[in-house]
């Protein structure tokens, strides 16, 4: 059966960039403009992706491969193959359905995308805050308070356990 398969199914001989045209005795016809086939033996060609709106064309469609899109500045890609564009925010902000909003006190975002995350709680590691956090930057933890003053007691009082991520003032 395998030996005669190509005789019984002439479409299997059609290479990528063509389709098996049933209207023309199953001969291999080139994909029409704005369409492609990425594999051989296809009976139709797929419509090329169009990069509209803030989608930009990163790679043009060819007869054997689809177009690829990315997003114009001010937006970034989301999803497989950049299926969506999502707006950027400034550092120190996060995106909500109401648009870009500043990070709440005790949280930060050092990127143009993603959500605000809580500051590191240095006291959980027995350390002290060396540099305070901001909306754009996490706190910098330093040595434990005991390490800073040799004469100090080695017992460090626990930090107040109110809202995690808030740096001591």
């Amino acid at each position: 059966f395998e030996r005669t398969r190509s005789l019984q199914d002439p479409c299997s001989n059609c290479p990528a960039g063509t389709f098996c045209d049933n209207n023309r005795n199953q001969i291999c016809s080139p994909c029409p403009p704005n369409s492609f086939s990425s594999a051989g033996g296809q009976r139709t060609c797929d419509i090329c992706r169009q990069c509209k709106g803030v989608f930009r064309t990163r790679k043009e469609c060819s007869s054997t491969s689809n177009a690829e899109c990315d997003c114009t500045p001010g937006f970034h890609c989301l999803g497989a193959g950049c299926s969506m564009c999502e707006q950027d925010c400034k550092q120190g902000q996060e995106l909500t359905k109401k648009g870009c909003k500043d990070c709440c006190f005790g949280t930060f975002n050092d990127q143009k995308r993603g959500i605000c995350r809580p500051w590191t709680n240095c006291s959980l590691d027995g350390k002290s805050v060396l540099v305070n956090g901001t909306k754009e930057r996490d706190v910098v933890c330093g040595p434990s308070p005991a390490d800073l003053s040799p004469g100090a007691s080695s017992v460090t009082p626990p930090a107040p356990a109110r809202e995690p991520g808030h740096s001591p003032q």
């Epitope: 709106g53 999803g79 299926s83 999502e86 909500t96």
Partner: nanobody, 123 residues
Framework: EVQLVESGGGLVQPGGSLRLSCAAS????????MNWVRQAPGKEAEWVAN????????YYVDSVKGRFTISRDNAKNSLFLQMNSLRDEDTAVYYC????????????????WGQGTTVTVSS
């Protein structure tokens, strides 16, 4: 075919008004958040406004609050942007965009876009 087609752009004087429309086809319009996004010449693209599925939630970028109103007519598969008190800085190509399937769930990607309509504010 899933499609969005904007219309209503044009040349208007500062202080004037325009109403943009967006006709949707090929998908269940009433099931999606919808957005307006604009891109001014030589500037980054900017989200302008969005509206939820039934029109009960509407949000705007600060620069257009009190001047622009987003609305929708689900029976006619249409999205609108009423623009009043237009300023020079509102000059841009305005795009209609569909919110992605998980829009509002910590993701705000837009997956279907129109070709845009040009608004020029000039005296």
């Amino acid at each position: 075919e899933v499609q969005l087609v904007e219309s209503g752009g044009g040349l208007v004087q500062p202080g004037g008004s325009l109403r943009l429309s967006c006709a949707a086809s090929g998908f269940t319009f009433r099931s999606y958040w919808m957005n307006w996004v604009r891109q001014a010449p030589g500037k980054e693209a900017e989200w302008v406004a969005n509206i939820n599925q039934d029109g009960s939630e509407k949000y705007y970028v600060d620069s257009v609050k009190g001047r622009f109103t987003i609305s929708r007519d689900n029976a006619k598969n249409s999205l609108f942007l009423q623009m009043n008190s237009l300023r020079d800085e509102d000059t841009a190509v305005y795009y209609c965009a569909r919110g992605g399937p998980d829009y509002g769930d910590l993701h705000y990607g837009m997956d279907v876009w129109g070709q845009g309509t040009t608004v020029t504010v000039s005296s």
